[in-house]
């Protein structure tokens, strides 16, 4: 025998109280697949989470958090505050990045610059508290004598793709 | 560091008010929720209310609109008075900050009730 | 309101072993649980968020995991400074509640 209830689509719940009819889930519930015997509450979103996808009768709401805060965690369980670009969240509040050190975002940890001499580069442009260094050309390329212009691709012939 | 310290009168008598105060060293004070949270003695913790920078607040059914909260953004401080104690009042009472779950706690004031 | 209730009430358990701590929720919650620790004489100190997401500072041998209603927190190892009393508590819906907690002591 089939179970009626799995007649009951997502939005519904069965309801034992009224011979195993689908009811729709009440107001702040929702039920996101067929066949459920009861329907799950809403998540509600206050304090520092604020709503990013109100709640349906088929799917749950979802939160996001306040402006100048950002999500950490399954679902966003929890609101971390933001910083500037050039900064990085302490226990003492949004700090500045040590010198040769830069964060690009309004959250995460100051990063060490790169290291161009370990890829055998120059420095093409300074690294600032906001962004990093750009690496250039090796010095050797930069030496006396040394074309900096890149030699043309030799022309391929028609019909074939690069390799 | 971010650092909730909290004081108030610590001994009342049934229907007085209890008032508390809570101050927030280091950190960032707005666009947070700070709360109240108090815990009978011996027993397990009960959420009381919350308020942010701007003054709003929500608080708990059971406490039966006795809860008034307060902030000072230019001190940095938070306030709770609960009006009409009796002596099921009596518990230690926290202040926390609220991120979702409260992640920073103030080191708790005992209050007692008794006539 | 959303109840949430711990068991066991006390967990005896030896330096080193290992202790596992439950938490229910009377209806879903999705994972938003949080696990805290708390001594005599201090605030409670946040473990957990998310069901399953450490908190800064928070050792490894602490680890959260479940949804829906179920949750447990684990300790791997105890060691002399766990031994406390824990609390789950739900952050889904408002009011805001707590489990009744869980003593964890020495056997």
């Known amino acids: 025998l089939q179970d009626p209830c799995s007649n009951c689509p997502a939005g519904t719940f069965c309801d034992n109280n009224r011979n195993q009819i689908c009811s729709p889930c009440p107001p702040n519930s929702f039920s996101s697949a067929g066949g459920q015997r009861t329907c799950d509450i809403c998540r509600q979103c206050k304090g520092v989470f604020r709503t990013r996808k109100e709640c349906s009768s088929t799917s749950n709401a979802e939160c996001d958090c306040t402006p100048g805060f950002h999500c950490l965690g399954a679902g966003c369980s929890m609101c971390e505050q933001d910083c500037k670009q050039g900064q990085e969240l302490t226990k003492k509040g949004c700090k500045d990045c040590c010198f040769g050190t830069f964060n690009d975002q309004k959250r995460g940890i100051c990063r060490p610059w790169t290291n161009c001499s370990l890829d055998g580069k120059s420095v093409l442009v300074n690294g600032t508290k906001e962004r990093d260094v750009v690496c250039g050309p090796s010095p050797a390329d930069l030496s006396p004598g040394a074309s900096s212009v890149t030699p043309p691709a030799p022309a391929r012939e028609p019909g074939h793709s690069p390799q | 560091q971010v650092q909730l310290q909290q004081w108030g009168a610590g001994l009342l008598k049934p229907s007085e008010t209890l008032s508390l105060t809570c101050a927030v060293y280091g950190g960032s004070f707005s666009g947070y929720y700070w709360s109240w949270i108090r815990q009978p003695p011996g027993k397990g913790l009960e959420w009381i209310g919350e308020?942010?920078?701007?003054?709003?607040?929500d608080s708990n059914p059971s406490l039966k609109g006795r809860v008034t909260f307060s902030v000072d953004t230019s001190k940095n401080q938070f306030s709770l008075k609960l009006n009409s104690v009796t002596a099921a009042d009596t518990a230690v009472y926290y202040c926390?900050?609220?991120?979702?779950?409260?992640?920073?706690w103030g080191q708790g004031t005992l209050v007692t009730v008794s006539s | 309101e959303i109840v949430m209730t711990q068991s066991p009430a006390t967990l005896s358990v030896s330096p080193g072993e290992r202790a596992t701590l439950s938490c229910r929720a009377s209806q879903s919650i999705s994972s938003i649980l949080a696990w805290y620790q708390q001594k005599p004489g201090q605030a409670p100190r946040l473990l957990i968020y998310?069901?399953?997401t450490r908190a800064t500072g928070i050792p490894a041998r602490f680890s959260g995991s479940g949804s829906g209603t179920e949750f447990t927190l684990t300790i791997s190892s105890l060691q002399s400074e766990d031994f406390a009393v824990y609390y789950c508590?739900?952050?889904?819906?408002?009011?805001?509640?707590f489990g009744g907690g869980t003593k964890v002591e020495i056997k």
């Open positions: 508590q739900q952050y889904y819906n408002w009011p805001l509640t």
């Open positions: 926390a900050r609220l991120t979702g779950p409260f992640d920073y």
């Open positions: 998310g069901a399953s």
């Open positions: 308020i942010n920078h701007s003054g709003s607040t």
